[in-house]
Interface confidence: medium
């Protein structure tokens, strides 16, 4: 969980295409959980961008106190700033709540860099622009924190949307979505549609701008385009799905599938980048720069380091390949791909030398803990997390960033053998994996 | 918009000191280079330091080193040339310039110096 | 100290001439070299960067070219406001240095 990159920030067999296609089982979307069509409450209600996270507005407590959240689908606690911080504007206050209700128990959640720690409790929690539903649910009271709170993004808590399983300080601790779905008649699915804006924004902009929607309880079919592609998920933690191939410009990375999924790959909307194990990292590298070899980047570009710069519009996106993603399908033997564009993993930064330069950040980095399809990735798509039938969906979004020669894509069917094979098998301990 | 603004300068006597400020806004100042450019009355441009905030590299002229310091506060977006034993020869409008530093690649190359300030009339003189 | 020497120091041109200064260094500085123009009273303004890229906002009668050691700024058709000091600059190595200015006044 690395600051600057996991937000807060903390920032072989694999299965060729045969040129088989499998017939959809049916030409009609299957019966979805949740409502469908129009969630027009819901739609926009996100702020923000992906170098610092994308927030929804809550309130908190007995009377309401309002507060913009980071949507996190890469953690399961729900946690706010509760005492006076000099990045937070505001942060809730239990004293002035008459619904709070103390747990008398601490949680401490360290990271890489950085850490939170705070008191558990309970309280009432809705979301104005979300379901009409008010529910008791868990709060972690954040009374002391280093490198969590991020200056300027205008967010003073976290909603981990994920499992149980990775809750802090345990599994016993329900997260947020479960007591929803719990004391409500939600259904128990989600969806995400986070809109890169594809130019730097400044605070005053992100705080005008959209920055996409968290549908509650179903699917809105204008935030997408095309077909939905579901890819099931594997355990119920994180939000875990097996890749099992990759192609940089159509050209096959050729690496044992195990290695994408080494140890783990997740969907992590509190991720800023697309993060790869260190090998398929350096494979990916490799090949996005023969791809690109027009033009030459110092390596320090490669490494997240260096910024490249050129002339207001004069950006050259043709010079950089698209990247696809096999996912597992739903049925056996069938895979769909994902394919973004350098639109979603040059990431364009706001703190540029002068307003007459577009600087861009590679925003795909190594990673020890397994891939993580992070908000470069959610850019391109709208996500669906259909926790009922335990699967994610991919489509394109309505408003993922492209130019007038290419667009992001969700394709398939394509023939995949031997899927189950791609997904790597965690040894068993006592030791948390969390802190990564 | 980018504003570098420059500010000290003054009349001071040979062996005096004297600090000048240079005020920034409109880009990061944190990932520039900030340089002090002198030009002495009816003469050419001369170099005489520069600083990387974000590094915190500093470099100088022989002609003022020992005596110069550049510094900058990140904070207040300013960077600062304390001027010590101040020459005659140290007379000339004092100019402040940012270049994106190393940070910042330029698929074209790295850029120069692309924003100066108004500058600053130093006089020494008894 | 890498020396710029600066060629001619002064000139005399009409309005649409085309004039070239010549920058020499004393060793070689890559293409890390850029051109500035001056006016009385007022500070260098940036022509040109990394030896032949046009800065943005400066018309394209103004180009740059070399590597190495030696060093072309070209103004293709003289105007009236074109009538300044142009200066050369290194910046591949620290100290910093400039040429001596080129004065490009009315013939």
């Known amino acids: 969980t690395q600051h600057g990159i996991r937000l807060p920030l903390r920032s072989g067999l694999g299965g060729a295409p045969l040129g088989l296609r499998l017939p959809r089982e049916t030409d009609e979307e299957p019966e979805e959980p949740g409502r469908r069509g129009s969630f027009v409450e819901m739609v926009d209600n996100l702020r923000g961008k992906s170098g610092q996270g994308y927030y929804v507005e809550m309130t908190v407590g007995s009377p309401p106190q309002t507060l913009n959240i980071l949507v996190d689908t890469g953690s399961s606690n729900f946690a706010v700033g509760a005492a006076p911080h000099p990045f937070l504007h505001r942060y809730y206050q239990r004293q002035l709540s008459s619904t709070y209700r103390d747990l008398r128990k601490g949680v401490y959640v360290p990271y890489t860099q950085g850490k939170w720690e705070g008191e558990l409790g309970t309280d009432l929690v809705s979301i104005p622009h979300g379901p009409n539903v008010t529910v008791r649910a868990n709060i972690a009271a954040i009374t002391e924190s280093d490198k969590f709170f991020i200056n300027g993004s205008n967010w003073e808590g976290i909603l981990g949307l994920a499992y149980a399983e990775i809750a802090r300080p345990d599994d016993s601790l329900e997260p947020f979505f479960d007591s929803l779905v719990k004391q409500t008649h939600v259904p128990n699915l989600f969806s995400l549609q986070l809109c890169g804006a594809g130019f730097p924004l400044n605070q005053s902009e992100v705080l005008a701008s959209v920055g996409g929607s968290m549908i509650i309880g179903g699917i809105d079919h204008s935030l997408y385009t095309g077909s939905l592609w579901y890819t099931p998920i594997r355990r119920e933690w994180y939000y875990e799905v097996i890749i099992v191939r990759v192609e940089i410009n159509g050209q096959d990375l050729k690496m044992d599938c195990k290695e994408y999924n080494y140890d783990k790959s997740i969907v992590d909307s509190g991720t800023t980048n697309l993060r790869l194990p260190k090998k398929v990292f350096e494979a990916a590298v490799k090949s996005i720069k023969a791809a690109s070899s027009t033009e030459k980047f110092p390596d320090g570009f490669w490494l997240g380091e260096q910024l490249v710069c050129w002339q207001a519009g004069t950006t050259p996106w043709n010079i950089f390949p698209v990247i696809s993603l096999y996912l597992m399908g739903e049925v056996t033997n069938q895979s769909f791909r994902i394919t973004i564009l350098p639109q979603q993993y040059l990431r364009p930064v706001e703190d540029v030398a002068t307003s007459q330069d577009d600087c861009y950040k590679f925003a795909i980095s190594q990673s020890s803990t397994g891939t993580v399809m992070g908000a470069v990735i959610m850019e391109g798509f709208y996500v669906v997390f259909d926790r009922a039938r335990k699967r994610i969906g991919f489509a394109v979004s309505a408003c993922h960033v492209h130019d007038e020669f290419r667009t992001a894509a969700v394709e398939g069917p394509f023939v995949t053998l031997d899927m189950e094979d791609c997904g790597y098998n965690i040894p068993q301990t006592d030791e948390s994996t969390l802190m990564t | 918009e980018v504003q570098l603004v420059e500010s000290g300068g003054g009349l001071v006597q040979p062996g005096g000191s004297l600090r000048l400020s240079c005020a920034a806004s409109?880009?990061?100042?944190?990932?520039?280079?900030i340089h002090w450019v002198r030009q002495a009355p009816g003469k050419g441009l001369e170099w005489v330091a520069s600083?990387?905030?974000?590094?915190?590299?500093?470099s100088y002229a022989d002609s003022v080193k020992g005596r110069f310091t550049i510094s900058a506060d990140t904070s207040k977006n300013t960077a600062y040339l304390q001027m010590n034993s101040l020459r005659a020869e140290d007379t000339a409008v004092y100019y402040c310039?940012?270049?994106?530093?190393?940070?910042?690649?330029?698929?074209?190359?790295?850029?120069?110096?692309?924003?100066w300030g108004q500058g600053t009339l130093v006089t020494v003189s008894s | 100290d890498i020396q710029m020497t600066q060629s001619p120091s002064s000139l005399s041109a009409s309005v649409g001439d085309r004039v070239t200064i010549t920058c020499r260094a004393s060793?070689?500085?890559?293409?890390?070299v850029a051109w500035y123009q001056q006016k009385p009273g007022k500070a260098p303004k940036l022509l040109i960067w990394y030896a032949s890229w046009l800065y943005s906002g400066v018309p394209s009668r103004f180009s740059g070219s070399g590597s190495g050691t030696d060093f072309t700024l070209t103004i293709s058709s003289l105007q009236p406001e074109d009538f300044a000091t142009y200066y050369c600059?290194?910046?591949?190595?620290?100290?910093?240095?400039f040429g001596q200015g080129t004065k490009v006044e009315i013939k």
């Open positions: 600083i990387s905030p974000y590094s915190g590299y500093t």
């Open positions: 409109g880009f990061n100042f944190y990932y520039s280079s």
């Open positions: 310039a940012r270049q994106p530093t190393h940070y910042y690649y330029y698929a074209k190359g790295y850029k120069a110096m692309d924003y």
């Open positions: 600059q290194q910046y591949s190595y620290s100290p910093f240095t």
């Open positions: 060793q070689s500085v890559s293409s890390a």
